[in-house]
């Protein structure tokens, strides 16, 4: 039969979890459309394009788990959704929050 091919629609990027320093966060990426089903590649948009060393990526589900986030985890992240006939991207800005010093009276 005839197979209809559809490029990935613009994916949606979002953060799950607290952005406080030391927390674990999950970066989520998904396209509503795409035949065959897209795979997802996350990269950090700095000079290395590498994810932090504490990150694990699932290219099928479109998730990245970053454990024990630090100030070095902050920055722009890009998800590229791709299949046989096209690619589409979304961006996410992760800003890790440092704890505010408490005044001791």
């Amino acid at each position: 039969g005839l197979t209809v091919l559809v490029p990935p629609s613009a994916p949606h990027c979002q953060i799950q979890g607290s952005q406080d320093i030391g927390s674990d966060v999950i970066l989520l990426c998904s396209s509503e459309e795409g035949i065959p089903r897209p795979t997802y590649l996350w990269e950090k948009l700095d000079n290395t394009l590498k994810l932090p060393p504490t990150a694990t990526q699932d290219q099928v589900q479109g998730t990245v788990t970053i454990r024990n986030i630090s100030a070095l985890s902050s920055g722009l992240y890009q998800c590229v959704a791709s299949n046989a006939i096209g690619t589409s991207t979304c961006l996410l800005d992760l800003q890790v929050i440092s704890p505010q010093p408490r005044n001791i009276g």
Epitope: C13, N47, L91
Partner: antibody, heavy 119, light 108 residues
Framework: EVQLLESGGGLVQPGGSLRLSCAAS????????MSWVRQAPGKGLEWVSA????????YYADSVKGRFTISRDNSKNTLYLQMNSLRAEDTAVYYC????????????WGQGTLVTVSS | DIQMTQSPSSLSASVGDRVTITCRAS??????LNWYQQKPGKAPKLLIY???SLQSGVPSRFSGSGSGTDFTLTISSLQPEDFATYYC??????????FGQGTKVEIK
């Protein structure tokens, strides 16, 4: 297809008011921060104002603070700029633009609407 | 506010030339630097985001580099449709959002 269409520009006297609109289509409007950027004749780009996707946070350039008000109606997919106490130096083409992420790069722009402040 | 300074303000070049435009930030902006192209009477168009990432649909002759305070936009082989004004923009501490003053690329 993402489209942004500005309207409401025109000729106004110094001290007068004008309301610009930007009709958005082709994307989930409430998910994106939006900005107004202007360009005076023969000059460079100047950011004017920004608003969060929900409309709960607004930001202004010092040059327009207290005179301009940015707002949005997510049910109508429309962005607004209310301009009061207009000055000659506000004369410019006003663009609405979509922030791709947070308040980062502008990935889509409208065609612009010209505001002329002159007596 | 972060100030963005572009150089040169204008340049003359021929088709096929390699063109380099620089942008300097008044303080470190990491990789939060974007480049736009604007032609007369038209809205700006995003070329490069995050200092070096090419926007979809933009020809590969355009490239960006740099981080911190110093950034470069390079056109490897200038084409007739590339004659335009180019702007850098920082999105590190934004809002406020700041642009460079622009670089006009003219035909020699």
């Amino acid at each position: 297809e993402v489209q942004l269409l500005e309207s409401g520009g025109g000729l106004v006297q110094p001290g007068g008011s004008l309301r610009l609109s930007c009709a958005a289509s082709g994307f989930t409007f409430s998910s994106y921060a939006m900005s107004w950027v202007r360009q005076a004749p023969g000059k460079g780009l100047e950011w004017v104002s920004a608003i969060s996707g929900s409309g709960g946070s607004t930001y202004y350039a010092d040059s327009v603070k207290g005179r301009f008000t940015i707002s949005r109606d997510n049910s109508k997919n429309t962005l607004y700029l209310q301009m009061n106490s207009l000055r000659a130096e506000d004369t410019a083409v006003y663009y609405c633009a979509r922030h791709w992420v947070s308040y980062g790069p502008f990935d889509y722009w409208g065609q612009g609407t010209l505001v002329t402040v002159s007596s | 506010d972060i100030q963005m300074t572009q150089s040169p303000s204008s340049l003359s070049a021929s088709v096929g030339d390699r063109v380099t435009i620089t942008c300097r930030a008044s303080q470190s902006i990491s990789s939060y630097l974007n480049w736009y192209q604007q032609k007369p009477g038209k809205a700006p168009k995003l070329l490069i985001y995050a200092a070096s990432s090419l926007q979809s649909g933009v020809p590969s002759r355009f490239s960006g580099s740099g981080s911190g305070t110093d950034f470069t936009l390079t056109i490897s082989s200038l084409q007739p449709e590339d004659f335009a004004t180019y702007y850098c923009q920082q999105s590190h501490q934004s809002p406020p959002i700041t642009f460079g003053q622009g670089t006009k690329v003219e035909i020699k």
